[in-house]
């Protein structure tokens, strides 16, 4: 990996062992200033593999609300607006990092957690398996 | 929101004001035990709106490596395997949280940062705008 020279102004950390505890400032910096969220907001409806968004809430997690995509159909929407079962709508999944309160119900102590979320759906050619 | 009773065994936190600093254990807990990653790994190639994955590396960020999807075509792949420009391939984007080293180059001090990543692509019906 890349070795980074340590900044002499870094805060001290007592525990140098893994699992290591670090300090995190929760005042979120948003890098998404030049994006237009309106543009992609209706893709879930206009896609040939449309999806619904379901709210997943967990007060022990940060962020507490995550939206999960569920494909509306097994097939994909064709040019006539009908479901075509020769193709399949499948969820596009991504692993994301969240903070889990640990110990539970603590406002200032967390553990990093990796979760898999479905972000949207795409239309794919199914793989054919010949079974006995 | 939901009020959670505070666990009496929580670590003390000096600063009760925002921006608040919390302790985070970086020993990641992986919740994705019952998923089959093989199933979705080739969707980028089999989709009617295929995409390429580009590696984005930043040693000042945690995770340092993030994969960004870029749609291969403006149009979508039709049943004959040709690009159909009546439809459009568009990226599905998601806001994710990452940790940004702050001050820079510090191994144990971070700030939460929100970034927008393209996870994959989907095929949509373009909106027609009539302009003068």
């Amino acid at each position: 990996g890349i070795t980074i020279p340590r900044n002499p102004g870094c805060p001290n950390s007592e525990d140098k062992n893994f699992p290591r505890t670090v300090m995190v400032n929760l005042n979120i910096h948003n890098r998404n200033t030049n994006t237009n969220p309106k543009r992609s907001s209706d893709y879930y409806n206009r896609s040939t593999s449309p999806w619904n968004l379901h709210r997943n809430e967990d007060p022990e997690r940060y962020p507490s609300v995550i939206w999960e995509a569920k494909c509306r159909h097994l097939g994909c929407i064709n040019a006539d607006g009908n479901v075509d079962y020769h193709m399949n709508s499948v969820p596009i999944q991504q692993e994301i990092l969240v903070l889990r309160r640990e110990p539970p119900h603590c406002p200032n102590s967390f553990r990093l957690e990796k979760i898999l979320v479905s972000v949207g759906c795409t239309c794919v050619t199914p793989i054919v398996h010949h079974v006995a | 929101g939901i009020t959670i009773p505070r666990n009496p065994g929580c670590p003390n936190s000096e600063d009760k004001n925002f921006p608040r600093t919390v302790m985070v254990n970086l020993n990641i807990h992986n919740r994705n035990t019952n998923t089959n990653p093989k199933r979705s790994s080739d969707y980028y190639n089999r989709s009617t709106s295929p995409w390429n994955l580009h590696r984005n590396e930043d040693p000042e960020r945690y995770p340092s490596v993030i994969w960004e999807a870029k749609c291969r075509h403006l149009g979508c792949i039709n049943a004959d395997g040709n690009v159909d420009y009546h439809m459009n391939s568009v990226p599905i984007q998601q806001e994710i949280l990452v940790l940004r080293r702050e001050p820079p180059h510090c191994p144990n001090s971070f700030r939460l940062e929100k970034i927008l990543v393209s996870v994959g692509c989907t095929c949509v019906t373009p909106i027609v705008h009539h302009v003068a």
Partner: nanobody
């Protein structure tokens, strides 16, 4: 691992009827479907009929609408294809299929021959 067992088929006169059956076992998700494809040698595989595992939604190819009926017995994941008013052009190998999102599992196939 998905397993499919299909039965039925055979030789029938034009205008006659046949019933195909198929049962599936293994990993079945709520967003899946079962049905039949058919294939004539040298021609492309055709989706004949399909039924959604949980919703019960059905799909029929235009060529078989009002003649074929697909039904499902939920308890043991068995489907039936009732084929009435059969025509010579229905002659083909019929494959039972189980469709999970992104994956299509096909059975061993059964011959249906309609003689004129």
């Amino acid at each position: 691992q998905v397993q499919l067992v299909q039965s039925g088929g055979g030789l029938v006169q034009t205008g006659g009827s046949l019933r195909l059956s198929c049962s599936v076992s293994g990993d079945i998700s709520s967003q899946s479907a079962m049905g039949w494809y058919r294939q004539v040698p040298g021609r492309q595989r055709e989706l004949v009929a399909m039924i959604h595992t949980t919703k019960g939604d059905t799909y029929y190819a235009d060529s078989v609408k009002d003649r074929f009926t697909i039904s499902r017995i939920n308890a043991n994941n068995t489907i039936h294809l009732q084929m009435n008013n059969l025509k010579p052009e229905d002659t083909a190998i019929y494959y039972c299929t189980h469709n999970e999102p992104g994956d299509l599992y096909m059975g061993q196939g059964t011959q249906v021959t309609v003689s004129s």
